[in-house]
């Protein structure tokens, strides 16, 4: 079958309250079929390629296990299998100033070099 | 051929801890997400958690991870699961399990035995 | 977490017979289901994964199907080691979750 191109699927918006727990779902397809060599799954806030990270985890060739690297106030959880082209990440104890735009990118590395992030991120509403 | 050799059973007070251990052996070890799978008597099964040998690197289910310690030694590749303030309901079999990969896609390729531990006072 | 459902929870089929177990997500998993037998004090055995794909030495007589939510395991014609109990797993979230499980009989 011909190789997928790089896309990453976002809802808009994802609404939820102060003091709960919202998740922001992110999945993506890309052209590097069978791939399983090292990975890098990050979210962050504000703006694309740019705004501060919130979320970062890498994972070793061969492994699914995505190990956290940051994980801004210990508030952020991926759900997602990035193997299995899902970022999906959990926020929880939602705070007012978590009201903005999220982006998730993954990278992958060793014998493939290729990255890819979400342009328009989803908006993540805390009322 | 791969074969991953898990120790016997044990019988625990609650309040005690367990540690079980799984000897991996016909693959290269640090390779490998090693999963642990426990099975309640006459229940299904559930997923407690990983380790990626290469790296030490850990993931866990949040329903254990205050009581859960996966770790593994390299040098004898064998993988362990310590559970801690064991309960009744922890009377359980414990399983290892190797994370296989085939172009792409990761399965549950070799299971141990399976450890029984129960937990009684 | 996802909870994954099965249906039935047991299936009683005459040898030579079509067994079907049906697997239901809480939520999309994509194509991200494995599929395991058991029998009686022995450990799980890998029979499909990636929702279709059958491993290594399985027989061809066990087939899945499925995406998103809705999954199938069948057995196009039952022999006599097939029973056991089957369960299903996704592994698209994490923690990774199993059906409760289907138990396989001889009618």
């Known amino acids: 079958s011909p190789a997928q191109r790089w896309s990453m699927q976002v809802p808009p918006e994802v609404s939820a309250e102060a003091g709960d727990a919202a998740v922001l779902p992110c999945t993506f397809t890309h052209p590097h079929r069978h791939y399983d060599g090292p990975l890098t799954a990050i979210w962050r806030a504000g703006e694309p390629y740019a705004g501060p990270q919130v979320f970062r985890c890498a994972a070793a060739r061969g492994s699914e296990l995505c190990q956290t690297a940051l994980s801004l106030h210990g508030r952020f959880r991926l759900l997602g299998n990035p193997r299995r082209n899902d970022l999906s990440l959990r926020v929880e104890r939602l705070a007012l100033a978590d009201d903005r735009r999220y982006f998730c990118r993954v990278e992958f590395a060793g014998d493939v070099h290729d990255r890819y992030e979400s342009r328009h991120g989803v908006r993540l509403h805390v009322t | 051929q791969v074969q991953l050799v898990q120790s016997g059973a044990e019988v625990k007070k609650p309040g005690a801890s367990v540690k079980v251990s799984c000897k991996a052996s016909g693959y290269t070890f640090p390779r490998y997400d090693v999963s642990w799978v426990r099975q309640a008597p006459g229940q299904g099964l559930e997923w407690m958690g990983v380790i990626h040998p290469g790296s030490g690197g850990t993931g866990y289910n949040e329903k254990f991870k205050a009581r859960v310690t996966i770790t593994v030694d390299t040098s004898t590749s064998t993988a362990y699961m310590e559970l801690s303030s064991l309960r009744s309901e922890d009377t359980a079999v414990y399983y290892c399990?190797?994370?296989?990969?085939?172009?792409?896609?990761?399965?549950?390729?070799?299971w141990g035995q399976g450890t029984l531990v129960t937990v009684s006072s | 977490d996802i909870v994954m459902t099965q249906s039935p929870d047991s299936l009683a089929v005459s040898l030579g017979e079509r067994a079907t177990i049906n697997c239901k997500a809480s939520?999309?998993?994509?194509?991200?289901v494995d599929w395991y037998q058991q029998k009686p004090g022995q450990p799980p055995k890998l029979l499909i994964y990636e929702s279709t794909n059958r491993y290594t030495g399985v027989p061809d007589r066990f087939s899945g199907s499925g995406s998103g939510t809705d999954f199938t395991l069948t057995i196009s014609s039952l022999q006599a080691e097939d029973v056991a109990v089957y369960y299903c797993?996704?592994?698209?979230?994490?923690?990774?979750?199993f059906g409760q499980g289907t138990k396989v009989e001889i009618k």
């Open positions: 797993m996704q592994s698209n979230f994490f923690p990774f979750t």
């Open positions: 399990a190797r994370r296989g990969l085939n172009k792409g896609y990761w399965f549950f390729d070799f």
């Open positions: 939520q999309n998993v994509g194509s991200n």
